[in-house]
Structures are given as structure tokens and as C-alpha cells.
Interface confidence: low
């Protein structure tokens, strides 16, 4: 149990106040983290509070400003990047968001040696992506869907691709679906370790159906936004991977990397690229039916100037119980021999663990094991492997960092973080310098987040990088809710939940209950992290109990729970929320006439289905930007979990699992449906269809749209949204304004 102290003593009670909605909307209690921008084994850059770019040397203790805030301000720079030879810095300005990760910007190159901006052969604008080579100061950038290379910042560019076309051919950057559902990056190009080669993906969207929606703007006529967006079962992008020698780019031009034959025989995806050495690269491919993944190690053939991917270097990963991997297929971390690697995949008991692959996957050596999961491999050095897992004390919602000494035999395991600040810190991530000489630990909670610097050899804490003192002081007179993380055992299923309780919680009283749900495949909501957010306010000020439940389909508790939802989304996720609510009622402090559920995106889908479950448990609920039919959502995501919407595959469940099919069941609940009209991700179409079905069924409901807002409903829309939802819930729960 994690009880967040509310620090209420009778003598102090008058000076303490509850959280207000304004606190949340103003971000009054937001926290800071410190991630060093490592530039060597012992040096890192950091942007100071006054916007200077400062270089810190851990070993000498010295720091100096490499770029002044004046220089940053001169081009209105909001970001920077130092070239590895430390001669140049790119400055990024005019940030213009596109999708989740992608944005365009203007880039200026500043020459540190003479303190001037590079003039002549300036970069075009706006640029879609730009990066330095890992060594020296070569630049690769993407402009108008084509890739360009500069040997030095002042040189004229070498154009690598010529076929780039808006919404048709994407070179070096992903199209919408690859960005959102496969790569989770704004880029699709990768430098080899020493910058000799540049690999890139070409996405051909020529045949993909287009989603079109109005963007109202301020003009007399709305604009139409067109995005090639493959929905479930539709034509997918065609991907090709090329590699070009950046030293002599004109020599033979880009060379295509062959796709493994067993992948190329039907529709497929490229899932990631990992350089091993300058002349060895590892590509991962995935069948469209995403239960077979192939990892292919390719070598440069000097004599042919091509890339050779022998069948003996193909490693197949297949799932017989669900899809391949977790949310994504994991990526390999290569060892120093440049052929063997470490990778996380399911063991024979159905738990994701680290394996060491030397020759074949069949002969893999299991490195970690147990009824818990290894989550991320951070770094492999010659003598240590650093990873995170949720092993400690059997709480799946925790993350601790471990070190396995692979240089000694037998290898020994040490938890680096488990006992550092045990009450405050149970959820960590880490950032390592070159050769893991030093590392930063970032603790996200459950207490106030703290970032610290450590010696990579001894694990000794060197200094605190950020401890959020101002936040700690600001919270001293706030009545924070209590939080507890516990589990329910129901029919051989473990349902972990987080309950957020009002500050003066009294088990003998009855409280309204709000379920906050996400519930998407491979997600996790019950985490030991710090947050002061809308639900904190609802508990603190409005006296609600809020619960988050991780049911079937959620992650990091083994494949049985994860893959339970395979090919039948919308069934068990909903069932498990309902089961948990019944258990909460049995606890005796829930007012069963005042229970609500809300969720966003996948959570909007689950909350809608829960409201329409016909159980009579819920008085009201909110769906923000919900999916309403899996036929409306992206192919890569949807088909991973649902298969294809064809008669001979899974069309029947696609049809059965829509919100529209349950329109009649909304008659006895208060439903608030909310969506942004410019949602590129979960299209407004989803809510439009729910609304149409409800109208056709003559069911009353409430709705709010946000004009020109995307899936995030940001800016002023956020304030309006949370204010609106607060009013709705207070009305539902008969709470006075």
C-alpha cells in the first residue's frame, strides 16, 4: 500500500487547503525531471533556467556555457543540437507541430569556433527532420520528403532522394501510420556508428485511402486536411530500406536492403533498424498478420557495394498465443562481438524476459526469469547489463533498475535502485553516458520526483540533479488525496488497482466513485508514480473516490493476461472494469447510486461499452475521443490485436464490438461524448457514428466537440474540457457547485 501523507494535523487544519481545478489547469503542481544530454563518458549538456546551454564535466567538476541565451534568443531557438566534433550547434526555431512526434522547424547552424552563424548554403525551410552524424559534423536532413546530406554545414547539399512527394512518397520520415503505430518517432533514417553510412526508409503511400476532414480556421472556406491513413483491412504503405555511403554518396547511390523471403511473400512491415557496426546492420520486419517477426542481420559487401542479408543471420520470433512482442516487438542490444545480442521476448512460461542470442533463437540463453517481466534493456557494456523490471516486491506497477555483471561467472544480479529512497521512489528510468561511465536516475514517484547522478562503476550517488524543492514547498499546505495500490483476485485473474481517496477519507462513509479507464492492449494505468492532476482534484476538493484498474489485456504481468484480449477487443477489458466496481461496492464505502466511468481514446471506447453493458452499475460516464468501431482505426494497431475485418478472418467480432451496436443500452445512463473535429488519430467519424446511432435509437445524450482540435485537445480546449467534465460529474453526483 502506498499512502501518500496528507499531512493533516488538527493544529494545521485551518492552514491546509484542498486542490482547486485552477491549480490543475495552471499546472501549479507540475514537476521537473533532469535528463543529461550526454556528449561523452563524463560530460553532458543542459539548458539552464536562464536558457544558456551549459557543458558539465563530472570528473573535473567544471562547467561552462557553450552557447549563450543571447545567441539562442537571436533566432528564437527553442532547441539545440551539438555536433559530435563540437564545432557546430544547430538551433531549432519556428517549431510547428504535425502529428504525435513529427514537427517542422527552421534550423540555423552556429559555428562555435568563430562565434558566428554559418552563412552560405543555408538550410531550406521548413525542415522535417535534421540530425548530425554520430562522428564529425555531417548533416542529414529531410526537406519536402527528400533526404539531403551535407559533408560540412557550409557545404552545398547532396540530394540523396528525388521522388519525395507530399502524402505520396516519404523518404527519411515516416508516414502517419508508421509514425504513430510502428516507429514512434518523427524520423526514419539512421546513421551508422561512425557516420560512414546512412540508412533510410522510403514509404510509398500512393495507394493508401485518404482520411479527409475539415479544418475550419478563420477563413471564409474551411481547409480540407488529407492524410493517407490505412484503416483496418485497407491498403498499407509499401516500405523499402536503402543505405547510402555518405563518404562517396555519388559513387553507387543508395543500395536497397533485401527483405527476408519469408516476410516478402505477403504484406509486411518494417519495424526497426539497429546499426551494429559501420558495416553491419540489423533490420526487423513483421508480417501484416503480426505474429511473426524476423530479425535480419546484414553485412556490407565491399566488392559489390551492396548489403547482404544471409538466411543464416535471420532470426524468427513467433507468437502462438497472441501477437509478436508487447506493444512493439523489442529491439536487440548487441554485445561487443557485434553478432550476438540481448533481447526481451516471452519465455516458456509466458513472461517477457531478457535472452542472449548467439546463433539461433532456439538456442537462446535466458538471462532473467520469474513471474514478473523485464521491461527495458538500457545498456550493455563489456562487463554489465543494465535493465529495468517490475520484480521488486511483486508490484507490477513499479520499475527498478538492475545490473547484471556479465563479465563474471556466474553472472550476478544487483538491484541498483530498490533501496535508494524506498518510500519516495519506486518507479525509475535511467540515462547512461558513453560506456556507462556515469548514469542519471530519474524517479517518477510515488513521492515527489527526483533526478540523481551516479557513478557507473560503483553505483554511488554523486549529486542530486533535480529534487523539486519548490514543488515540495508548494504542496506543504495542500490536502492531497491518499493513494493506495492493491490487488483483487477474481477467477484466477489478478486485477491490480489504484485507489485515490479524499484527504479525510472515512471507511464508514459513502463516497461517489469515478472509474478512470484506459485499458488498451499492453498498457498499464496502475503505476507507482507521482501526479497532481484532475482526478487528484476530484478526490481532494470534491470528495470523490477514483479508481484505476488494470484488467485483461494490460501489460507486464505475463502473456496470459496480455494476450487474453487477442482477436476480441472490447470484451474482457470491459468485464474486468465491471468486476472491479462490484468488488469496490463490497468494500462498503462506495455509494452505489453514484458511480461513473470516464476514459479517453481507447479508454473512451471502454467507458462507452461499460456504460452500455446493461449492468445498471453506472449512473453516468464520459467518453473523450473514443474509438467506436475497429473498422475506423489504423490498420497497424488494430490488426495487431484483431486480425483482419474479412469474413474468413475476424469480421464478425469487428461488427460485434462497436459502440453503435449497443446504442439502445445508453438509454438508462447519462452519457457525455466529446471529440476534437481535427483528430488525425481517432477520427471524429468515430463519435459522429456514435451520435448518429444514439439519435436513430432516440436516446438522449450530451456532447461537446472541439473545433480544429486533435486527439490531445490542448491549449484553451483543455481548460474548457476539464471544466465541462467537472460540471457534468458534479451534476451526476449531485454535488453543489
Amino acid at each position: 500500500i502506498v499512502l501518500r501523507p496528507s499531512r493533516v494535523h488538527n493544529s494545521e487544519e485551518n492552514t491546509m487547503r484542498a486542490l482547486t481545478l485552477k491549480d490543475i489547469l495552471n499546472g501549479t503542481f507540475s514537476y521537473k525531471t533532469f535528463f543529461p544530454n550526454w556528449i561523452s563518458g563524463q560530460e553532458y549538456l543542459h539548458q539552464s533556467a536562464d536558457n544558456n546551454i551549459v557543458l558539465y564535466n563530472i570528473e573535473t567538476g567544471q562547467s561552462y556555457t557553450i552557447l549563450s541565451n543571447r545567441t539562442m534568443k537571436s533566432v528564437n531557438a527553442s532547441n539545440y543540437g551539438l555536433s559530435p566534433d563540437r564545432q557546430f550547434v544547430y538551433l531549432e526555431s519556428d517549431y510547428s507541430k504535425l502529428w504525435r512526434y513529427s514537427y517542422t522547424a527552421t534550423y540555423y547552424i552556429y559555428d562555435l569556433s568563430n562565434g558566428e552563424f554559418v552563412r552560405g548554403n543555408e538550410l531550406p525551410r521548413p525542415i522535417q527532420y535534421l540530425c548530425w552524424s554520430p562522428v564529425g559534423s555531417k548533416l542529414a536532413y529531410v526537406y519536402q520528403n527528400n533526404i539531403y546530406l551535407k559533408q560540412r554545414p557550409g557545404d552545398p547539399p547532396f540530394q540523396i532522394t528525388f521522388n519525395g512527394r507530399e502524402n505520396k512518397i516519404f523518404n527519411g520520415i515516416p508516414d502517419w501510420v508508421y509514425e504513430e503505430e510502428m516507429l514512434a518517432t518523427k524520423y526514419a533514417l539512421w546513421w551508422s556508428p561512425n557516420g560512414k553510412f546512412l540508412a533510410y526508409a522510403e514509404f510509398n503511400d500512393t495507394d493508401i485511402p485518404v482520411i479527409a476532414y475539415s479544418y475550419y480556421g478563420d477563413e471564409q472556406y474551411p481547409r480540407t486536411i488529407n492524410i493517407p491513413y490505412p484503416k483496418a483491412g485497407a491498403k498499407n504503405p509499401v516500405v523499402r530500406i536503402f543505405i547510402i555511403d555518405t563518404t562517396y554518396p555519388a559513387y553507387v547511390g543508395p543500395q536497397e536492403v533485401p527483405v527476408p523471403a519469408m516476410i516478402a511473400s505477403s504484406d509486411y512491415y518494417f519495424s526497426w533498424l539497429t546499426w551494429v557496426t559501420d558495416e553491419r546492420v540489423c533490420l526487423q520486419w513483421l508480417k501484416r498478420v503480426q505474429n511473426v517477426s524476423v530479425l535480419s542481420i546484414c553485412d556490407f559487401r565491399e566488392d559489390w557495394q551492396t548489403w547482404d542479408c544471409p538466411k543464416t543471420q535471420e532470426h524468427i520470433e513467433e507468437s502462438r498465443t497472441g501477437w509478436a512482442g508487447g506493444f512493439f516487438v523489442s529491439t536487440p542490444v548487441f554485445s561487443y562481438d557485434a553478432i550476438s545480442y540481448y533481447k526481451i521476448f516471452s519465455d516458456k512460461d509466458g513472461y517477457k524476459h531478457i535472452h542472449y542470442i548467439k546463433d539461433t533463437v532456439e538456442n537462446a540463453i535466458q538471462i532473467t526469469s520469474g513471474k514478473w517481466e523485464a521491461i527495458n534493456i538500457f545498456r550493455v557494456t563489456q562487463d554489465s547489463l543494465f535493465y529495468s523490471s517490475n520484480e521488486f516486491e511483486e508490484y507490477p506497477g513499479r520499475r527498478n533498475i538492475y545490473r547484471i555483471s556479465i563479465g563474471s561467472y556466474p553472472p550476478s544480479k544487483k538491484c541498483v535502485t530498490c533501496h535508494l529512497r524506498k518510500e519516495r521512489c519506486q518507479y525509475y528510468t535511467a540515462s547512461f553516458s558513453d560506456y556507462a561511465k556515469y548514469y542519471a536516475l530519474v524517479c517518477y514517484g510515488p513521492g515527489i520526483p527526483i533526478s540523481t547522478l551516479h557513478d557507473g562503476r560503483t553505483d554511488q550517488e554523486i549529486k542530486i540533479l533535480e529534487e523539486n524543492k519548490e514543488l515540495e514547498n508548494a504542496l506543504k499546505n495542500i490536502q492531497l488525496p491518499k493513494e493506495e495500490i492493491k490487488k483483487l483476485e477474481v477467477d484466477e485473474i489478478t486485477l491490480w488497482y489504484k485507489m485515490i481517496l479524499p484527504p479525510q477519507f472515512d471507511r464508514s462513509k459513502k463516497y461517489p466513485l469515478l472509474i478512470q479507464v484506459y485499458g488498451g492492449p499492453c498498457s498499464q494505468s496502475v503505476r507507482s508514480v507521482f501526479a497532481v492532476n484532475w482526478i487528484s482534484y476530484l478526490a481532494s476538493k470534491e470528495g470523490m473516490v477514483i479508481a484505476l484498474v488494470d484488467g485483461r489485456g494490460t501489460a507486464f504481468q505475463g502473456d496470459k493476461l496480455l494476450y487474453a484480449v487477442y482477436r476480441k477487443l472490447g470484451v474482457y477489458e470491459v468485464e474486468d472494469q465491471i468486476t472491479a466496481v462490484r468488488k469496490f461496492i463490497e468494500m462498503g464505502f462506495i455509494d452505489e447510486k453514484r458511480i461513473a466511468i470516464w476514459g479517453w481514446s481507447y479508454g473512451g471506447y471502454v467507458s462507452s461499452l461499460a456504460l452500455a453493458s446493461g449492468t445498471g452499475l453506472f449512473k453516468c460516464g464520459i467518453a473523450v475521443a473514443p474509438v467506436s468501431s475497429w473498422e475506423y482505426y489504423a490498420s497497424v494497431y488494430t490488426e495487431r490485436f484483431m486480425g483482419l475485418p474479412t469474413k474468413d478472418d475476424n469480421l464478425e467480432h469487428y461488427k460485434n464490438s462497436t459502440v453503435m451496436a449497443r446504442a439502445e443500452y445508453f438509454r438508462n445512463v447519462d452519457y457525455l461524448l466529446i471529440h476534437g473535429t481535427a483528430d488525425d488519430n481517432v477520427h471524429f467519424q468515430n463519435s459522429a457514428q456514435i451520435a448518429k446511432a444514439l439519435v436513430n435509437a432516440q436516446v438522449d445524450f450530451q456532447a461537446m466537440w472541439y473545433s480544429d482540435q486533435n486527439h490531445g485537445l490542448s491549449g484553451l480546449s483543455t481548460n474548457h474540457l476539464y471544466t465541462h467534465m467537472t460540471h457534468f460529474l458534479k451534476q451526476c453526483f449531485s454535488l453543489s457547485d
Epitope: P157, G253, Q305
Partner: antibody, heavy 122, light 107 residues
């Protein structure tokens, strides 16, 4: 349509220099390498080198190193090849030929100029 | 430098014949081989690139095959306009080099 038009025939004395021009039209000049290939009377084809019109980078066959200069003027989509210290065995037809700069396999030379005859004779 | 050899150096054939010309590289050149046709007094014309890819506008009776060091140009049914000299060219490494040519004339 796509074409390469070369300058007219030249007669030069040994030791002199010759500069042949090649004007491109109908396509993006900077998107293709420009090769120079020569053919002595009754002989086969000999590759001299290429220029990347985008960057100005050049690559020559070793035997022409120090004698050949390849340049371009992107504003008028024209490539130039200058051969100095001419000898009688430089008598040949000189061709410019474009080659696509993208993708794999070093695409072939798909469009050729009409050729410029250079005669070196005392 | 990579040496290219062609055989035969010349051949006589009739209209409708199937003609095969071979080209050998002195070292492995992968698929970096192009074939050209040249008629007297004219500039060469690209027929095949990357060993087997037919250049657009070239009749399908022309085909190329091979990889590594041995390559073949085949004309499945010789036409009157095909009487010419054929050159192979490697594009694997600098300097690019041409074969000596194969002259195809009327029998």
C-alpha cells in the same frame, strides 16, 4: 523532351586545350550525374569521368588525372569538359551522357549527347 | 581497374535468330552491369541496366541476365534494326569500364 546538345567539332594542335560544352534540357539538371565518354575512330567506348551537377563533385579515370577539368553552370544547365595538353591519340568523338543519381545499382547512362568530334593534328 | 571482356567480338546472324552475347568482368561486380547498342555515326543507346532491368522504350526482345562476373545479353528474335555494335559497361567501381564491343552484322 529530354536532350543533351553538345558544342560543335573542334580541330586542335598538340599541346593545346579543348573545352566541350553539353547543354541539358527537359529534365532537372542537378538530379543526374553527367558522364563524359570518348570514342577514338574505329575503337570502343572509354569512360573519362563524371560530375555531380548538384555539388560540383567530380570523379575521373586515373589516366586523365591532371589533364581533364569538369565543371558545370547550373544556371544554364550546362556541363563542360576541358582536356588540356592534347595529343594526337586524343582524337575522338566526345560524348556527354546523363546518369540518374537516385537508388541502387548505379543506373546506366540513359541519355547521350550527339557527340563532339575533336581532331588533334599538327 | 576492372577489365571487361566480351565474346564473340563479332557475329553474323539472320533476322529472326536468337542472339546471345556474353560479357565477363575481371572481378565480382554484383549486378552493376549495363548494356548499350551503338550504330555507326550515332551515340550509344542504353538497353539494359543493373544486369537485367530493361530500359524504358527498349523492345522486350532484349533481355539481360547474370551477376557477379558473368553476364549475358540476349536478343530473342533479331530484327533488321538490331544490327549494331553492343557494349557492356560495369558500374561497380571507378573507373567505369566498357567491354570492347560485339559487332552484330547480317549473315
Amino acid at each position: 523532351q529530354v536532350q543533351l546538345v553538345q558544342s560543335g567539332a573542334e580541330v586542335k594542335k598538340p599541346g593545346a586545350s579543348v573545352k566541350v560544352s553539353c547543354k541539358a534540357s527537359g529534365y532537372t539538371f542537378t538530379g543526374y550525374y553527367m558522364n563524359w565518354v570518348r570514342q577514338a575512330p574505329g575503337q570502343g567506348l572509354e569512360w573519362m569521368g563524371w560530375i555531380n551537377p548538384q555539388s560540383g563533385d567530380v570523379n575521373f579515370a586515373q589516366k586523365f588525372q591532371g589533364r581533364v577539368t569538369m565543371t558545370r553552370d547550373t544556371s544554364i544547365s550546362t556541363a563542360y569538359m576541358e582536356l588540356s595538353r592534347l595529343r594526337s591519340d586524343d582524337t575522338a568523338v566526345y560524348y556527354c551522357a546523363r546518369q540518374f543519381r537516385g537508388y541502387s545499382y548505379g543506373y546506366g547512362m540513359d541519355v547521350w549527347g550527339q557527340g563532339t568530334t575533336v581532331t588533334v593534328s599538327s | 581497374d576492372i577489365q571487361m571482356t566480351q565474346s564473340p567480338s563479332s557475329l553474323s546472324a539472320s533476322v529472326g535468330d536468337r542472339v546471345t552475347i556474353t560479357c565477363r568482368a575481371s572481378q565480382n561486380i554484383g549486378s552493376y552491369l549495363n548494356w548499350y547498342q551503338q550504330k555507326p555515326g550515332k551515340a550509344p543507346k542504353l538497353l539494359i541496366y543493373a544486369a537485367s532491368s530493361l530500359q524504358s522504350g527498349v523492345p522486350s526482345r532484349f533481355s539481360g541476365s547474370g551477376s557477379g562476373t558473368d553476364f549475358t545479353l540476349t536478343i530473342s528474335s533479331l530484327q533488321p534494326e538490331d544490327f549494331a555494335t553492343y557494349y557492356c559497361q560495369q558500374a561497380n567501381s571507378f573507373p567505369f569500364t566498357f567491354g570492347p564491343g560485339t559487332k552484330v552484322d547480317i549473315k
